[in-house]
């Protein structure tokens, strides 16, 4: 689970040992302060759970790229 | 310790309803769904729906969606399972079972309700 | 909807012995999203393995789980009298769409 260390900036300090798949993912951001220990993906869930994520993992990569292009496909 | 405590055995006409109760202790009820599983005697596991609370809205198995209802109430932790046009085939044992919503196995599991439609 | 067929229905084997057993899927189950329980008579389904390979809290590694795609397997490297059981497999992929194997009895020989 992410931690906010301020209003600003929520770190994660701990990532998800299991892949979720993406149709449980709704949307995600990228953590990249230089306040952070680690570079990290928080995953919004179709719960509204947030879980932090490897970036460098091949399964976060995929998500991530699958969740751009629901953004990008409008809904009929 | 997560617990599922379902309601007791039940005697039902044909035609009439019944609804079976399970109550959740020890976890959360927020990322979580209950599933409920039949199993008709000397038979195998049958899905029949599932809800996830914080969403209200439930799913079903095509085979009873019209005659199954499933609801939960997040207040009291406890979900419903609802079945009405009751025939002898429905004599089984229900079982609730947890799931967390990011997944999808059963981790925990009711101690089943013998619910049995006779005449 | 995708249907789960396990194979043999019953397996007749002594304790000390191997037990293969199998399920096949009628579609891709992706993500690997496929558990096994085990069920004694009385007894409600216990969950063994989740995501086709991952032993579930206080199951012993006698038992494994193996596969992807559409075929999947529950191994018991040596059976123990408390093993004879019912086995069945379970894959949920969808949330709105979960779906179960018919079972596969193990039986003492």
């Known amino acids: 689970q992410p931690d906010a260390i301020n209003a600003a900036v929520t770190c994660c300090y701990n990532f998800t040992n299991r892949k979720i798949s993406v149709q449980r993912l709704a949307s995600y951001r990228r953590i990249t302060s230089s306040k952070c220990p680690k570079e990290a993906v928080i995953f919004k869930t179709i719960v509204a759970k947030e879980i932090c994520a490897d970036p460098k993992q091949k399964w976060v990569q995929d998500s991530m790229d699958h969740l751009d292009k629901q953004i990008q496909t409008p809904k009929p | 310790q997560v617990q599922l405590v379902q309601s007791g055995a039940e005697v039902k006409k044909p035609g009439s309803s019944v609804k079976v109760s399970c109550k959740a202790s020890?976890?959360?009820?927020?990322?979580?769904?209950i599933s409920w599983v039949r199993q008709a005697p000397g038979q195998g596991l049958e899905w029949m729906g599932g809800?996830?609370?914080?969403?209200?809205?439930?799913n079903y198995a095509q085979k009873f969606q019209g005659r199954v209802t499933i609801t939960a109430d997040e207040s009291t932790s406890t979900a419903y399972m609802e079945l009405s046009s009751l025939r002898s085939e429905d004599t089984a044992v229900y079982y609730c079972?947890?799931?967390?919503?990011?997944?999808?196995?059963?981790?925990?599991w009711g101690q089943g309700t013998l619910v049995t439609v006779s005449s | 909807e995708i249907v789960l067929t396990q194979s043999p229905a019953t397996l007749s084997l002594s304790p000390g012995e191997r037990a293969t057993l199998s399920c096949r899927a009628s579609?891709?189950?992706?993500?690997?999203?496929l558990a096994w329980y085990q069920q004694k008579p009385g007894q409600a389904p216990r969950l063994l393995i989740y995501?086709?390979?991952d032993r579930a809290e206080g199951v012993p590694a006698r038992f494994s789980g193996s596969g992807s795609g559409t075929d999947f397997t529950l191994t018991i490297s040596s059976l123990e009298p408390e093993d004879f059981a019912v086995y069945y497999c379970?894959?949920?992929?969808?949330?709105?769409?979960?779906?179960f194997g018919q079972g596969t009895k193990v039986e003492i020989k």
């Open positions: 079972a947890r799931y967390d919503a990011h997944y999808g196995e059963l981790d925990f």
């Open positions: 020890g976890g959360t009820f927020s990322h979580y769904g």
């Open positions: 809800v996830i609370p914080i969403f209200h809205t439930a």
């Open positions: 579609q891709h189950v992706s993500d690997a999203y």
């Open positions: 995501d086709a390979s």
């Open positions: 379970h894959q949920y992929i969808h949330l709105h769409s979960f779906t």
